[in-house]
C-alpha cells in the first residue's frame, strides 16, 4: 500500500521510542466504555502519530482514536471485552509499534467521591464513608478500596487501610487528639477485572476532638 510517510520520515520515526500505556474505563458514560492511551515519553513528537485498535470489537474490526492534546481516546459501546485487541501507533497508515492487550486487564475505576468522616462520641470512633459509581455498574462492580489518612503535619506518613466495603471505622485511640487529619480513598478492580488504581478522591479534612467533644460531623 502506498501513502506512507515520505523522505525518510519513517526511518527517523523508527529511531524514536514509541512505548505507550493504556487504561480502559467500563460503563464510564452510561453503556459507553472508554480507552485512553498515551506515550511513556512525554517528549515524543505526536504531530502525525495516530492510535488504532483492531480486534475484540463488536461490529467493526478496527477503530481509530481521537487525539486530545497528548492523549489518545476512544469512547464506544463496541468493546467485546473477550480476548485481546491489537493497539497500534501509526504514522501515515504504517504501524510503528503495537501491543496485544485484553481490555479487561487494564481497567482503571472511576475515583470514589462523597468522602466524609463523622465522629461518634459514645463509641469514641470515626465513621468514614464514601461512594463509588461502580455500585451501579454491570461489569466492574467488585473493587478493593485503599483509604489513606495522615496527620496534616506528617507530610509523608500515610496510613493505609484496604477494604471492600464503602464504610470504615477508625478508633479514636489510634489517632492523635486535637489534630487535623487528611483522608482520601482510591479503588482498584478486585474480581475478574484487573488493572490500575483509580485517581484519588478529593481529600477530606477533619479534626480530632479533645477527649470530651460533642458528637456530629467533623468540620471540613
Amino acid at each position: 500500500e502506498s501513502g506512507y510517510a515520505q523522505n525518510g520520515d519513517l526511518e527517523d520515526a523508527e529511531l524514536d521510542d514509541y512505548s505507550f500505556s493504556c487504561y480502559s474505563q467500563l460503563e464510564v458514560n452510561g453503556s459507553q466504555h472508554s480507552l485512553t492511551c498515551a506515550f511513556e515519553d512525554p517528549d515524543v513528537n505526536t504531530t502525525n502519530l495516530e492510535f488504532e485498535i483492531c480486534g475484540a470489537l463488536v461490529e467493526v474490526k478496527c477503530l481509530s482514536f481521537r487525539k486530545l492534546q497528548e492523549i489518545y481516546f476512544i469512547e464506544t459501546k463496541k468493546f467485546l471485552l473477550i480476548g485481546k485487541s491489537n493497539i497500534c501507533v501509526k504514522v501515515g497508515g504504517k504501524s510503528l509499534t503495537c501491543k496485544k492487550i485484553d481490555l479487561t486487564t487494564i481497567v482503571k475505576p472511576e475515583a470514589p467521591f462523597d468522602l466524609s468522616v463523622i465522629y461518634r462520641e459514645g463509641a469514641n470512633d470515626f465513621v468514614v464513608t464514601f461512594n463509588t459509581s461502580h455500585l451501579q455498574k454491570k461489569y466492574v462492580k467488585v473493587l478493593m478500596h485503599d483509604v489513606a489518612y495522615r496527620q496534616e503535619k506528617d507530610e509523608n506518613k500515610w496510613m493505609h487501610v484496604n477494604l471492600s466495603s464503602t464504610k470504615l471505622t477508625l478508633l479514636q485511640r489510634n489517632l492523635q487528639p486535637e489534630a487535623m487529619y487528611e483522608i482520601k480513598v482510591r479503588s482498584i478492580p478486585d474480581h475478574y477485572f484487573k488493572g490500575f488504581w483509580s485517581e484519588w478522591s478529593p481529600s477530606y479534612y477533619f479534626r480530632t476532638p479533645e477527649i470530651n467533644n460533642s458528637p456530629g460531623e467533623m468540620d471540613p
Partner: antibody, heavy 114, light 106 residues
C-alpha cells in the same frame, strides 16, 4: 466526503473498476465499505477495507471481488470480474464508522449490457 | 448469513399517526441500525446502535429492540417522513440489510 466514479456501462463477462475518493477524512484511519443497490436484490453489502488494510468480503461474491486502496491519493478501489446483467446496480462507498455506516457517497450507476 | 425481514413492505400513514416498522433477524444480533432513503438519494443513517438517533433526526423517531426483534417508531407521522426505511445488522458477515419498508403519506 465520499465520491464514487467509474464507467456507467460494462460489457457482460468484463471487469468492473470503481474508485471511491475520500475527502475530509484520513483514509488510513477509516474503514471503507462498498454497498450496491439493485431493484431485484435491494441493498447488498459487498465488502470492506479496514483501517489496518485487512479486507472482508461478502461470501456470495468473494471469488469475483477485490477491494484495495491508495492512501496517498485518498482512494479506495473496487474490482469485480465476470459481470453479468444481475450486477446492474447503483454502487455506493460508505464509511464503516464506530456506530454505523455513517457517511455515504452519492452512488454511481453501473449497467451491465452488450 | 443473517436474514433481516422487514414488515410491512409498504404502508401509508396520515399526518399525526403513530407508525411502527419492525425488523426480525434470523439470528440474534448485537445492534440494529436504520437508514432512511428518499428517491434519487443515498441512504442516510437514521438510528444507530438500536436506539440512538443520528444527528439531525427529529425526536419523534425512536428505535428499540434486542436479540432478533427490533423496531423503528414514529410517534406522529409528518409529510417529510415519507421515505423507504432499511434495517442493517453488522454483527456478522456478510452485513445484511432488510428488504425495506416504503412509508407513504396518506
Amino acid at each position: 466526503q465520499l465520491k464514487e466514479s467509474g464507467p456507467g456501462l460494462v460489457q457482460p463477462s468484463q471487469t468492473l473498476s470503481l474508485t471511491c475518493t475520500v475527502s475530509g477524512l484520513s483514509l488510513p484511519n477509516n474503514n471503507i465499505a462498498w454497498i450496491r443497490q439493485s431493484p431485484g436484490k435491494g441493498l447488498e453489502w459487498m465488502g470492506v477495507i479496514w483501517s489496518n488494510g485487512d479486507t472482508d468480503y461478502n461470501s456470495a461474491i468473494r471469488s469475483r471481488l477485490s477491494i484495495s486502496r491508495d492512501s496517498s491519493k485518498s482512494q479506495v478501489f473496487l474490482r469485480m470480474n465476470s459481470l453479468q446483467s444481475e450486477d446492474t446496480a447503483m454502487y455506493f462507498c460508505a464509511r464503516e464508522g464506530m456506530t454505523t455506516l455513517d457517511y455515504w457517497g452519492q452512488g454511481v450507476v453501473v449497467t451491465v449490457s452488450s | 448469513e443473517i436474514v433481516l425481514t422487514q414488515s410491512p413492505t409498504t404502508m401509508a400513514a396520515s399526518p399525526g399517526e403513530k407508525v411502527t416498522i419492525t425488523c426480525r433477524a434470523s439470528s440474534s444480533v448485537s445492534y440494529m441500525h436504520w437508514f432512511q432513503q428518499k428517491s434519487g438519494s443515498s441512504p442516510k443513517p437514521w438510528i444507530y446502535d438500536s436506539s440512538d438517533l443520528a444527528s439531525g433526526v427529529p425526536d419523534r423517531f425512536s428505535g428499540s429492540g434486542s436479540g432478533t426483534s427490533y423496531s423503528l417508531t414514529i410517534s406522529s407521522m409528518e409529510a417529510e417522513d415519507a421515505a423507504t426505511y432499511y434495517c442493517l445488522q453488522r454483527s456478522s458477515y456478510p452485513r445484511t440489510f432488510g428488504g425495506g419498508t416504503k412509508l407513504e403519506l396518506k
